[in-house]
C-alpha cells in the first residue's frame, strides 16, 4: 500500500513540526493504525502511534509529543516538544486493520530540520 | 571545474548560515572570484560576490550580507541577516580570473533553510 | 533581480543597419552569458548572439556571422547588437537575455531554457 508524506519539514521555533501522511487505501478500512517512526544514524525508533476508527479522532497516549487528526485517507501529524537533536527522518506507517485483508504501507520518510532557539535575555 | 558544496544547510536561530565551496582547481589561479547566488521559484539572483588573491582574505562590499574565507581550494562562506523568507538554493559560482587560462564552475547549490524565530516576551 | 529593456528596433531596409541595444540592471554579472535572441512569426525562438562575460568570448550563428557584432558598454550598462547588411530574413522581435549560471561558457550551446531573465523585446522589420 502506497504511503505519501513530504520530504522535508521545518520545525517551528517552538519545537513544532507537522505533516500530512496520505495513503492509498485499497478497500474500506474502518480501523486504521497510524505509527511515527525516527530514523537518524541507522537507528530507527518509535516516536508515537494511534488506532483510530475511520472518521473518528486520532487518540495517542497522554504523554505522546505527537498529536493528529484524520480527513479521508489523510491523517494530519504534529510533533511538538522538538529539540535541535531531534532532526532526523521520521517514517509514517499506515496499517489498516479491520476489516480483513490486513494492508501495510511505509512512507520515504519526512526530513525534519530542528534549530534551538536563541534564549531569550534575562529581564532584570 | 568541478565545484562541491553541501546539499543542506539550516541557519542558526540569529540568522547566520555558513558553508563551504570548494573547488578542483585544474592549475595555479593566483586571482578568483566567488559569486553566491540564490535559487527560488525558478528566479536567480546574485546574493554577493567577491575577488580574491591566493592567500588572501576575501573582500565583499561593506553593504554585503556575505563574509567568507579561503584556506587552499576551498572557500568558507557566511550569510547573515537571513529571514524564513530567504529560505531557498544557494549557488556557489567560482571563477579562476588570472593567470589564464580562465575556468568557470558552478556547484549543485546548498539548501538553506531558515526559520523566523519567536518573539521574546516583553519585559514588563 | 536583473531588469532588461530593449530598444533600438523599427523598420530598415535590406541592406541597412540597426543597432539594438539592451540595458541591464546592477550589470555587469561576471561568469554569465548575455545573449540576443529573436522569433520571427510561427518560428521557435533562436540564438543570435552571445557573449560569456568571463571572458569576453561571443558566439553568433551561423545565420548572422559576419554581419553582426555584439559588445557590451560597461560604462553604460548596456548590451549592443551592431547588425549590418540586413536581410528581410532578419525579420523578427529581438530578445536580449541573461543566464547567470551557464552550464557552459559556449553560450549558444545549449540552447535558451536556462537562460534565467529576458527582456520585453523590440521589434526589428526588413523590407526588401
Known amino acids: 500500500m502506497h504511503v505519501a508524506q513530504p520530504a522535508v519539514v521545518l520545525a517551528s521555533s517552538r519545537g513544532i513540526a507537522s505533516f500530512v501522511c496520505e495513503y492509498a487505501s485499497p478497500g474500506k478500512a474502518t480501523e486504521v493504525r497510524v505509527t511515527v517512526l525516527r530514523q537518524a544514524d541507522s537507528q530507527v525508533t518509535e516516536v508515537c502511534a494511534a488506532t483510530y476508527m475511520m472518521g473518528n479522532e486520532l487518540t495517542f497516549l497522554d504523554d505522546s509529543i505527537c498529536t493528529g487528526t484524520s480527513s479521508g485517507n489523510q491523517v494530519n501529524l504534529t510533533i511538538q516538544g522538538l529539540r535541535a537533536m531531534d532532526t532526523g527522518l521520521y517514517i509514517c506507517k499506515v496499517e489498516l486493520m479491520y476489516p480483513p485483508p490486513y494492508y501495510l504501507g511505509i512512507g520515504n520518510g519526512t526530513q525534519i530540520y530542528v534549530i534551538d532557539p536563541e534564549p531569550c535575555p534575562d529581564s532584570d | 571545474m568541478h565545484v562541491a558544496q553541501p546539499a543542506v544547510v539550516l541557519a542558526s536561530s540569529r540568522g547566520i548560515a555558513s558553508f563551504v565551496c570548494e573547488y578542483a582547481s585544474p592549475g595555479k589561479a593566483t586571482e578568483v572570484r566567488v559569486t553566491v547566488l540564490r535559487q527560488a521559484d525558478s528566479q536567480v539572483t546574485e546574493v554577493c560576490a567577491a575577488t580574491y588573491m591566493m592567500g588572501n582574505e576575501l573582500t565583499f562590499l561593506d553593504d554585503s550580507i556575505c563574509t567568507g574565507t579561503s584556506s587552499g581550494n576551498q572557500v568558507n562562506l557566511t550569510i547573515q541577516g537571513l529571514r524564513a523568507m530567504d529560505t531557498g538554493l544557494y549557488i556557489c559560482k567560482v571563477e579562476l580570473m588570472y593567470p589564464p587560462p580562465y575556468y568557470l564552475g558552478i556547484g549543485n547549490g546548498t539548501q538553506i533553510y531558515v526559520i523566523d524565530p519567536e518573539p521574546c516576551p516583553d519585559s514588563d | 533581480q536583473v531588469q532588461l529593456q530593449e530598444s533600438g528596433g523599427g523598420p530598415v531596409q535590406a541592406g541597412g543597419s540597426l543597432r539594438l541595444s539592451c540595458a541591464v540592471s546592477k550589470y555587469p554579472y561576471s561568469g554569465s552569458c548575455m545573449g540576443w535572441f529573436r522569433q520571427a512569426p510561427g518560428k521557435e525562438r533562436e540564438g543570435v548572439a552571445a557573449m560569456f562575460t568571463g571572458t569576453g568570448s561571443t558566439y553568433y550563428a551561423d545565420s548572422v556571422k559576419g554581419r553582426f557584432t555584439i559588445s557590451q558598454n560597461v560604462a553604460k550598462n548596456t548590451l549592443d547588437l551592431q547588425m549590418n547588411s540586413l536581410k528581410p530574413e532578419d525579420t523578427a522581435m529581438y530578445y536580449c537575455?541573461?543566464?547567470?549560471?551557464?552550464?557552459?561558457?559556449?553560450?549558444?550551446?545549449?540552447?535558451?531554457?536556462?537562460?534565467?531573465?529576458w527582456g520585453q523585446g523590440t521589434q526589428v522589420t526588413v523590407s526588401s
Open positions: 537575455a541573461v543566464d547567470l549560471l551557464p552550464r557552459s561558457t559556449r553560450c549558444l550551446d545549449y540552447g535558451l531554457r536556462t537562460y534565467n531573465y
